[in-house]
């Protein structure tokens, strides 16, 4: 039961995380105008990965897409790439994990296959989350660098009568959405990997025959020394007479006409 819960929770957490990564990638507020020097501005600027926007105090908002590809900063291109890779990996991971879920039965899929799929999706979620966190962090670093550069420019060359106010940008909402979403995807991936360990079928249990030797009540089980000595992975208290030795958590029922893919 714990394995199913861990797997299911990992899936849900990753799903929320990937939805967040998609939302962050599409959001326009990656960087927003710093209002520290002018809290009563009548023009508010904010920028995303794909377009920059200006919201006027009058209520009108105008957004312009970055129609050039070569003219964009390499860092912005890198952030875009990281976010897209994160989304693609996450989407594939979600697809794989759907089929890996214990509660969904596809034909007579082996537990080992489900375990492998769970592990694969888990790794994909971890990489996806790391991509998102890396992308957002690279952008944040770029903002911090530009912020201090523009701050330095603000206080130099002010000998003239006319002031030229340079627009400074600070962290936008999308950065926080991205960090949280990346973290959730990462956590979901870790949970899937943990669930995979519980899903992995233990050594094949053959039909056991009990031989009652005089003096000692030892159950003989074909399959080597490990079977009865407490070493190896078979340390759970299991019934050894059912052929398909599984804990309650691992009961596999075969598809009936009421099962849906």
């Amino acid at each position: 039961m714990a394995v199913t819960a861990c797997q299911g929770l990992g899936f849900v957490v990753s799903l929320i995380g990937i939805a967040g990564i998609i939302a962050a990638t599409c959001m326009d507020q990656w960087s927003t105008q710093d209002l520290y020097n002018n809290p009563v501005t009548a023009v508010f600027n904010y920028q995303g990965l794909w377009r920059s926007c200006v919201r006027e105090s009058s209520g009108f908002t105008e957004c312009r897409g970055y129609f050039t590809l070569l003219g964009l900063p390499a860092m912005l291109q890198a952030v875009r790439a990281l976010m897209i890779v994160g989304i693609v990996l996450g989407a594939i991971g979600l697809l794989v994990s759907i089929f890996a879920l214990k509660c969904i039965r596809i034909g007579s899929m082996e537990d080992s296959a489900k375990a492998n799929m769970t592990l694969t999706s888990g790794i994909m979620f971890i990489v996806s989350g790391l991509c998102a966190i890396a992308g957002v962090s690279v952008f944040a670093n770029m903002l911090v660098t530009n912020f201090w550069m523009s701050t330095a420019n603000m206080y130099t060359g002010m000998g003239g009568m006319v002031q030229t106010v340079q627009t400074r940008y600070t962290f936008g909402a999308a950065l926080f959405v991205g960090w949280v979403a990346g973290g959730l995807t990462l956590i979901g991936g870790v949970m899937m990997c943990i669930a995979c360990r519980g899903l992995a079928p233990e050594e094949t249990n053959y039909k056991a025959v009990s031989y009652h030797a005089s003096g000692h009540s030892v159950a003989y089980k074909p399959g080597g020394f490990k079977a009865s000595t407490g070493f190896g992975s078979n340390t759970k208290n299991k019934k050894i007479y059912d052929g398909g030795a599984r804990t309650e958590d691992e009961v596999q029922s075969y598809p009936s006409k009421h099962d849906y893919v």
Partner: antibody, heavy 118, light 113 residues
């Protein structure tokens, strides 16, 4: 057709109060920011106050801050300017204006005259 | 606060003449986000409310004759009337739209010779 009609002007004693109204029609009032702009006799234009569509953002000129209050009633399409502690320098023609693209005023009312005198 | 300086304070012209008036701000009105200058020009005839002519320093409001042209960037702006008509006799105001307070210039009065 967009129409803005101001009312409520008149003669007021110094230190007195007055409430100006601006009835709007011909556009979706709640989606536009609105302003009050005044013009003293034989003088230039002076911006007084601003309120955005949902009243979440309000700004005042330093000369009226603390004395004037801008508000709006979106269901009734009316803009208000509550004026208190009036001074002789508040004597002017008061216009309400609609805020437009480029942070400009595209439509103005005909104005209402306020005279502060003893 | 941004200070707006309009010059000249008055202009005496003859019909058909080309007129230019200036508006200077103490701070740049250029917004890098959309590459626009937040300066507006109005025309006010006697006993009438002001009328919007040009916004974003150079964008003509619909219905405004094309003899009115706005230009300039940053801190220096100009309103040009290519061929003055008698109906153009009025006071012209510039206004900042970049930051509060939304200051107006003192105005340029256009008079007929």
């Amino acid at each position: 057709d967009v129409q803005l009609v101001e009312s409520g002007g008149g003669l007021v004693q110094p230190g007195g109060s007055r409430k100006l109204s601006c009835a709007a029609s011909g556009f979706t009032f709640s989606t536009f920011g609105m302003h009050w702009v005044r013009q003293a006799p034989e003088k230039g234009l002076e911006w007084v106050a601003f309120i955005n569509g949902d009243s979440s953002s309000i700004y005042y000129a330093d000369t009226v801050k603390g004395r004037f209050t801008i508000s709006r009633d979106n269901p009734k399409n009316i803009l208000f300017l509550q004026m208190t502690s009036l001074r002789s320098e508040d004597t002017a023609m008061y216009y309400c204006a609609r805020f437009a693209r480029g942070n400009s005023f595209d439509y103005w009312g005909q104005g209402t005259t306020l005279t502060v005198s003893s | 606060d941004i200070v707006m300086t309009q010059s000249p304070s008055s202009l005496t012209v003859t019909a058909g003449e080309k007129v230019t008036m200036s508006c200077k701000s103490s701070q740049s009105l250029f917004n890098s986000g959309n590459q626009k200058n937040y300066l507006t020009w109005y025309q006010q005839k006697p006993w009438q409310p002001p009328k919007l002519l040009i916004y974003w320093a150079s964008t003509r409001e619909s219905g405004v004759p094309d003899r009115f042209t706005g230009s300039g960037s940053g801190t220096d702006f100009t309103l040009t009337i290519t061929s003055v008509q008698t109906e153009d006799l009025a006071v012209y105001y510039c206004q900042i739209g970049y930051t509060y307070p939304l200051t107006f210039g003192a105005g340029t009065k256009l008079e007929l010779k």
